[in-house]
């Protein structure tokens, strides 16, 4: 039971990827505003998103402090232009989201092949190391420096003639491949945490290929 | 509990065509690479090619290149080998195997295998 | 393509004895080899990873290490179970590729 008219939130979805995280919910309010309360599991309740008519509320600065932490958060329902009235329990409506652990279940966001660069019959692949949310002493932390090693990324390479896809694998954010002399290949990347079980992957990157501005060739 | 299941294997002619299925369960493919490997009749383990069931990416190995092709329904949660143009040397015990994805950790768990034999 | 080259073919060894097989890559893998054992009529089962590290539920008598391109596994005591078909493999690059097997008999 809760205030008169007013209808507690459903469906409450975290959506993150690379940790800018968000709350979504619904329904669109008809008559009604929403707040959202965050919390670790340990700690105090935090408002944000005060009475608003949004249907999500961007937590990105909570979830930040501490990746690793499991977050709660709740979403309160109130009359528009009475937000003082609380339901018949003698509190707003509100509903809670699912736990949320940002460093286990936040989605891995596309990468970006940087460069490659051919000496020989050797290629030299780098994956742009992506600048996240979350910050440390005053400056933003990579993804890699996030994960560490966690993060693995999948190199799938492959010749411009031909379909096959190989494989190597980094944990750090170069390749070194062997080529056959002579040929063009293409590239792309595929972030990965191996030891998770839901959002291993990432999107792939978007294919790059030799003979393209990108690229660096030189013949020893 | 993380399980692989191969099933259609059987008796085929020479020239003649097969599927086999690797149904999953306790994981989903699509978070984990699916590898074909072979073995014939007393013989060793030959790999035969893998999918990524998340973008459909394969590779084959050069005796089945041409023949064979790796598939994948995510929404069954089963990766398929469609083997054509059978000759006798394909006769073997055809396994799935799930690919962790990690630099250590290759082939982490198998089925238990399906017999093809190609024979007139 | 890689090939890993795997001896003995076979062998004979006793309950208790020490069993040393080895496996040769023809260029470098780094640790990226993996170690299978399987017995008739059944599937490969993963014994060691990367290199030298113990795959669960494996028993410690099985170990194995690496020197550059040789790769061995080692059981330290041989037990009634152990006696199959051991398998390198490496999986450093597309195609991975397997060594020829070892087969260990009861002598």
């Known amino acids: 039971s809760g205030t008169t008219n007013t209808v507690a939130a459903y469906n409450l979805t975290w959506k993150s990827t690379n940790f800018k995280t968000i709350l979504e919910w619904e329904p669109k309010p008809v008559n009604q505003v929403y707040t959202v309360q965050i919390s670790t599991k340990s700690g105090d309740w935090k408002s944000k998103c005060f009475y608003t008519t949004d249907t999500e509320c961007d937590l990105t600065d909570e979830i930040v402090k501490d990746v690793k932490q499991t977050y709660l958060a709740r979403v309160f329902s109130y009359p528009a232009g009475n937000v003082e009235s609380t339901g018949s329990a003698g509190e707003p409506l509100y509903e809670n989201s699912p736990e949320f652990t940002p460093y286990l279940e936040t989605n891995l966001g596309q990468p970006t092949i940087q460069s490659f660069e051919q000496v020989g019959t050797k290629v030299n692949v780098t994956v742009e190391d992506e600048r996240t949310l979350v910050r440390r002493n005053n400056t933003f932390l990579s993804l890699r420096d996030v994960f560490g090693k966690d993060l693995i990324y999948t190199l799938y390479y492959w010749k411009s003639s031909s379909s096959g896809k190989k494989t190597a694998k980094t944990n750090t954010n170069e390749f070194l491949i062997d080529v056959d002399k002579g040929e063009n290949y293409c590239f792309s990347v595929q972030a990965v945490i191996p030891s998770r079980t839901v959002n291993r992957k990432s999107t792939d990157s978007p294919v790059e290929c030799m003979g393209q501005e990108k690229g660096e060739f030189r013949e020893i | 509990e993380v399980q692989l299941v191969e099933s259609g294997g059987g008796l085929v002619q020479p020239g003649g065509s097969l599927r086999l299925s690797c149904a999953a369960s306790g994981f989903t493919i699509s978070q984990y690479w699916i590898h074909w490997v072979r073995q014939a009749p007393g013989k060793g383990l030959e790999w035969v090619g893998y999918?990524?069931?998340?973008?459909?990416?394969?590779y084959y190995a050069d005796s089945v290149k041409g023949r064979f092709t790796i598939s994948a329904d995510t929404s069954k949660n089963t990766a398929y080998l469609q083997m054509n143009s059978l000759r006798a040397e394909d006769t073997a015990v055809y396994y799935c195997?799930?690919?962790?994805?990690?630099?250590?950790?290759?082939?982490?768990?198998w089925g238990q295998g399906t017999l093809v034999t190609v024979s007139s | 393509d890689i090939q890993m080259t795997q001896s003995p073919s076979s062998l004979s060894a006793s309950v208790g004895d020490r069993v040393t097989i080895t496996c040769r890559a023809s260029?470098?893998?780094?640790?990226?080899v993996a170690w299978y054992q399987q017995k008739p009529g059944k599937a490969p089962k993963l014994l060691i990873y990367?290199?030298?590290f113990l795959y669960s539920g494996v028993p410690s008598r099985f170990s194995g290490s690496r020197s550059g391109t040789d790769f061995t596994l080692t059981i330290s005591s041989l037990q009634p179970e152990d006696f199959a078909t051991y398998y390198c493999q490496q999986h450093y690059t597309t195609p991975p590729t397997f060594g020829q097997g070892t087969k260990v008999e009861i002598k």
């Open positions: 260029q470098d893998v780094n640790t990226a």
């Open positions: 990367s290199a030298s």
């Open positions: 999918i990524d069931p998340y973008n459909g990416y394969t």
């Open positions: 195997a799930r690919d962790y994805g990690s630099l250590q950790v290759q082939l982490d768990y």
